[in-house]
Interface confidence: low
């Protein structure tokens, strides 16, 4: 008598979540008589998936009519596959008995479920940083299978390489999660920059998922300050301007001090954007020279985005302004450096 063979031709089958999986099994002989049963897993804890002989298995249907004579095809179809269905399935021949006696098992077919990763979610730093500093962005995506996945980071189309990526869990699982951190060095040009986390997976058919974050949420571009003085007007008033340039975000408060006393405070609002996304702001102060006997020390004090105030001071020389209309007088700059990096 020829020895019975239970043949599972495919070592593995991969199915997209939601689809149906066909698990093939044929036997080489109708003898001995006995049912075929399908199990997921091996050993004492195995799970019964289908029993040709009895039971109700709503998601499982036989491919061929098991009642048909000479049927040696005991393949099954499992509908509406989920990641929880992943595992190795065994087609097992039983010899008729009471109870039935397990005779022979097929080699097993590993069912892997291709589950799409969730849309990548990119989160940036909690606090803003300035140019030349490194900030971290995190990208997370969940629920995918199989485990193999590719995640790339881009900044303005250029791939980043200072990246640390982990896929969990390390062992076998029905589905996996990926978490990646990219370290990005900010430049003053980055207000309009964007980082993209791109996830490629077998389920996406070459159309990767992308999550984005704008560096505008992560960057602070400190302002440059420049104080200039216009020529004196006929009414002995000097127009002094404080130009605050190339800053981001817009949150900025400017205070004028005359000889250390607050003269006026202004808040920036509804400023037009520069091409690079930064803002400029100019504030004017009229100083009545004739009202002062001594030189006037003017300070333009700028507090940007909650950072320590930056000052630019200079003196208006009263002696340089006779009572008639004067010419252009350069302000004496006694302030801090024009480029304030904090």
């Amino acid at each position: 008598e020829e020895e019975l063979q239970v043949i599972q031709p495919e070592k593995s089958v991969s199915v997209a979540a939601g689809d149906s999986a066909t698990l093939n099994c044929t036997v080489s002989s109708l003898i001995p008589v006995g049912p075929i049963q399908w199990f997921r897993g091996a050993g004492p804890g195995r799970e019964l998936i289908y029993n040709l002989k009895e039971g109700h298995f709503p998601r499982v249907t036989p491919v061929s009519d098991p009642t048909k004579r000479n049927n040696m095809d005991f393949s099954i179809r499992i509908s509406n596959i989920t990641p929880a269905d992943a595992g190795t399935y065994y087609c097992v021949k039983f010899r008729k008995g009471s109870p039935d006696v397990e005779l022979k098992s097929g080699a097993g077919t590993e069912l892997s479920v291709r589950a799409k990763p969730s849309a990548p979610v990119v989160s940036g730093p909690a606090v803003r940083a300035t140019a030349e500093h490194t900030v971290s962005f995190t990208c997370e995506s969940h629920g995918f299978s199989p485990r193999d996945i590719t995640l790339k980071w881009f900044k303005n189309g250029n791939e980043l390489s200072d990246v640390q990526t982990n896929v969990d869990p390390a062992g076998k699982s029905v589905s996996y999660s990926i978490r990646s951190t990219a370290r990005v060095v900010l430049t003053r040009r980055d207000v309009h920059s964007q980082v993209i986390c791109e996830v490629a997976h077998v389920t996406l058919q070459g159309d990767p998922l992308r999550g984005t974050a704008n560096l505008s949420e992560a960057i602070r571009v400190p302002p440059f300050l420049e104080v200039t003085q216009q020529s004196m007007r006929a009414d002995n008033q000097v127009n002094v301007t404080c130009q605050v340039t190339k800053f981001y975000p817009q949150r900025l408060q400017l205070t004028w001090l005359e000889n250390g006393n607050v003269s006026r405070t202004e808040m920036a609002s509804a400023l037009p954007e520069n091409k690079d996304g930064t803002y400029n702001w100019t504030s004017w102060l009229l100083v009545n020279v004739s009202a002062h006997r001594d030189d006037v020390k003017l300070t333009c004090q700028v507090e940007h985005d909650g950072q320590p105030a930056v000052n630019k001071s200079f003196s208006v020389k009263v002696s340089a302004h006779p009572k008639e209309q004067g010419s252009n007088t350069a302000a004496e700059n006694t302030g801090t450096n024009e480029r304030n990096i904090y």
Partner: antibody
Framework: RQLVESGGGLVQPGGSLRLSCTAS????????ISWVRQAPGKGLEYIGT?????ITYFASWAKGRFTGSKTSSTAYMELSSLRSEDTAVYFC????????????WGQGTLVTVSS | DIEMTQSPSSVSASVGDRVTLTCQAS????????LAWYQQKPGQAPKLLIY???TLATGVPSRFSGSGSGTDFTLTISSLQPEDFATYYC???????????FGGGTKVEIK
């Protein structure tokens, strides 16, 4: 504060070379290192910048053949598929342009591509 | 990519002369001020003079000054000194990080 290049020399066409730029007196960790070359009797030509961290960018003509990396004290530039027109003095300089200009510069290292 | 054109390619001048060198960009440089000037003497590495179009680098004599914005820039040496005879290069930066281009250089020679 100085930069010292090394690694130049004679190389055959198609060959590769790795140039080093070592800093003394300061750290490279918070600055980019830029590479500039100068062919004999010619002007300066910007090659690329190795940014803070590991971000690198190169002039369009240099992409693919030139790559770079950096530690806190040394920057490297790998030159591959070298051609005779790559013969030049190669300078490194601290900085990445705009408000971080190239300063200081190394003394340069001569790369000669010839069979 | 941005292109930088320097003129003249050479200039002859005497000690004490006021010398003006120009640099023109094919498009506005980044921020209208991404322009630096470098001085190079034979057999030496370049030396930074001016950056951000008009900011004098540390240790550079005040006779050097830079001006200009957008596409047109000027380096002025108010009173030429013997040590100033050299080749001067401008370096302009476009909107892309890697778009940094030197001009062809201007050689300042003794008349």
């Amino acid at each position: 504060r100085q930069l010292v290049e090394s690694g130049g020399g004679l190389v055959q066409p198609g060959g590769s070379l790795r140039l080093s730029c070592t800093a003394s007196g300061f750290s490279l960790s918070s600055h980019g290192i830029s590479w500039v070359r100068q062919a004999p009797g010619k002007g300066l030509e910007y090659i690329g910048t190795i940014g803070t961290g590991v971000i690198t960018y190169f002039a369009s003509w240099a992409k693919g053949r030139f790559t770079g990396s950096k530690t806190s004290s040394t920057a490297y530039m790998e030159l591959s598929s070298l051609r005779s027109e790559d013969t030049a003095v190669y300078f490194c300089a601290r900085g990445s342009a705009w408000n971080d200009p190239f300063d200081p510069w190394g003394q340069g290292t001569l790369v000669t591509v010839s069979s | 990519d941005i292109e930088m054109t320097q003129s003249p390619s050479s200039v002859s001048a005497s000690v004490g002369d006021r010398v003006t060198l120009t640099c023109q960009a094919s498009q506005s440089v980044y921020g209208n001020n991404d322009l630096a000037w470098y001085q190079q003497k034979p057999g030496q590495a370049p030396k930074l003079l001016i950056y951000l179009a008009s900011t004098l680098a540390t240790g550079v004599p005040s006779r050097f000054s830079g001006s200009g914005s957008g596409t047109d820039f000027t380096l002025t040496i108010s009173s030429l000194q013997p040590e100033d005879f050299a080749t001067y290069y401008c370096l302009g930066g476009g909107d892309d990080e890697a778009d940094n281009v030197f001009g062809g250089g201007t050689k300042v020679e003794i008349k």
